[in-house]
């Protein structure tokens, strides 16, 4: 499957209003630093067929997504960049999940792919609980705006690989 | 509010198959992996699997792996849990949890649906 | 596989006491992963307490968790009688994700 040429346009889209949606100076929120293990190895592109590697970045921005679709995201971030943010990845799902359904149709995930996507679920839900124990301040969501730009950006770059395979 | 409606109870002979169904509403359907539990008589919960509705890819455990296929149809926001070559052991309470994380993970859980195999 | 085993199977006190609660897993968990429920019978179980030691929405203070590596703990400080039912310890850390057998409290 052949992810269309808008999707790579959607990637750079979403990676620039998330850099616009950023609200406070990274530097005063030095002290709500954190690592949240973004795993990676899920996202080198080597150890696994494109077909696996579609369904791992689906999870990555549908989990993405989910998070920014919340109540606490609604009031933490600027309505209209909040809304167009959200309508890029949508779009990219869209993508994605017809791709997953094509390459493969509808069957049993391969063994090996299932850990890479429980190890992306994972990590956000390392996201998840930080939020909520910083009981989702301004600097918390900073904190991981900057952490889910970076994400993007190894989902973006995976992608990029993908196409160079093809 | 989120809600997850089962299908009715349904009594089969063993070496039928049934199929169970769960209706999502007051969410997103596609945006979180749906779970099948079971809990025989008496006796605890066991995880068999999920389904992600976005795209339809399943995740089986290997116990159940071979005799049980869950589907979903986007049109209706309703995901199914078939089980075949059915025995007496599989006599149960079948639940759907939706996923999420931190406080949503099995937030939400349908009302049941019991499945009795005798012959 | 990850097993978790849960004890007492019965624990019979009465209202007013404290209740602890133990799950141990048989291999490590990450305590993000691992949740308590609650179930009543006739009813689908209830979310009392996510990653270990978080209190799910409207679940009353006096439930606490905590726990790490294999060993978790769910205590009820001071049993109500609406607090009578079986708790189950469940973890997603691995798959196949895998509940507790269950402890079951009893009135005394």
């Known amino acids: 499957c052949d992810l269309p040429q808008t999707h790579s346009l959607g990637n750079r889209r979403a990676l620039i209003l998330l850099a616009q949606m950023g609200r406070i100076s990274h530097f005063s929120c030095l002290k709500d630093r954190h690592d949240f293990g973004f795993p990676e190895e899920e996202f080198d592109g080597h150890q696994f067929q494109k077909t696996q590697a579609i369904s791992v970045l689906h999870e990555m921005i549908q989990q993405t997504f989910n998070l920014f679709s919340t109540e606490d995201s609604s009031a933490a971030w600027e309505q209209s960049l909040l809304e167009k943010f959200s309508t890029e990845l949508y779009q990219q799902l869209n993508d994605l999940e017809a791709c997953v359904i094509q390459e493969v149709g509808v069957e049993e995930t391969p063994l090996m792919n299932v850990d890479s996507i429980l190890a992306v679920r994972k990590y956000f839900q390392r996201i998840t609980l930080y939020l909520t124990e910083k009981k989702y301040s301004p600097c918390a969501w900073e904190v991981v705006r900057a952490e889910i730009m970076r994400s993007l950006s190894f989902s973006t770059n995976l992608q990029k690989r993908l196409r160079r395979k093809d | 509010q989120v809600q997850l409606v089962q299908s009715g109870a349904e009594v089969k002979k063993p070496g039928a198959s049934v199929k169970v169904s769960c209706k999502a509403s007051g969410y997103t359907f596609r945006n979180y992996w749906m779970h099948w539990v079971r809990q025989a008589p008496g006796q605890g919960l066991e995880w068999m699997g999920e389904?992600?509705?976005?795209?339809?890819?399943?995740i089986y455990a290997q116990k159940f792996q071979g005799r049980v296929t869950m589907t979903r149809d986007t049109s209706t926001s309703t995901v199914y849990m078939e089980l075949s070559s059915l025995r007496s052991e599989d006599t149960a309470v079948y639940y759907c949890a939706r996923g999420g994380l931190g406080p949503a993970w099995f937030a939400y859980w349908g009302q049941g649906t019991l499945v009795t195999v005798s012959s | 596989e990850i097993v978790l085993t849960q004890s007492p199977a019965t624990l019979s006190l009465s209202p007013g006491e404290r209740a602890t609660l133990s799950c141990s897993a048989g291999s490590s968990v990450d305590s993000s992963e691992l949740y308590w429920y609650q179930q009543k019978p006739g009813q689908a179980p209830r979310l009392l307490i996510y990653s270990t030691s978080n209190l799910a929405s409207g679940i009353p203070a006096r439930f606490s968790g905590s726990g790490s590596g294999t060993d978790f703990t769910l205590t009820i400080s001071s049993l109500e009688p609406e607090d009578f039912a079986v708790y189950y310890c469940h973890q997603w850390s691995s798959y196949p994700f895998t509940f507790g057998q269950g402890t079951k409290l009893e009135i005394k």
């Open positions: 389904i992600n509705p976005s795209h339809g890819r399943t």
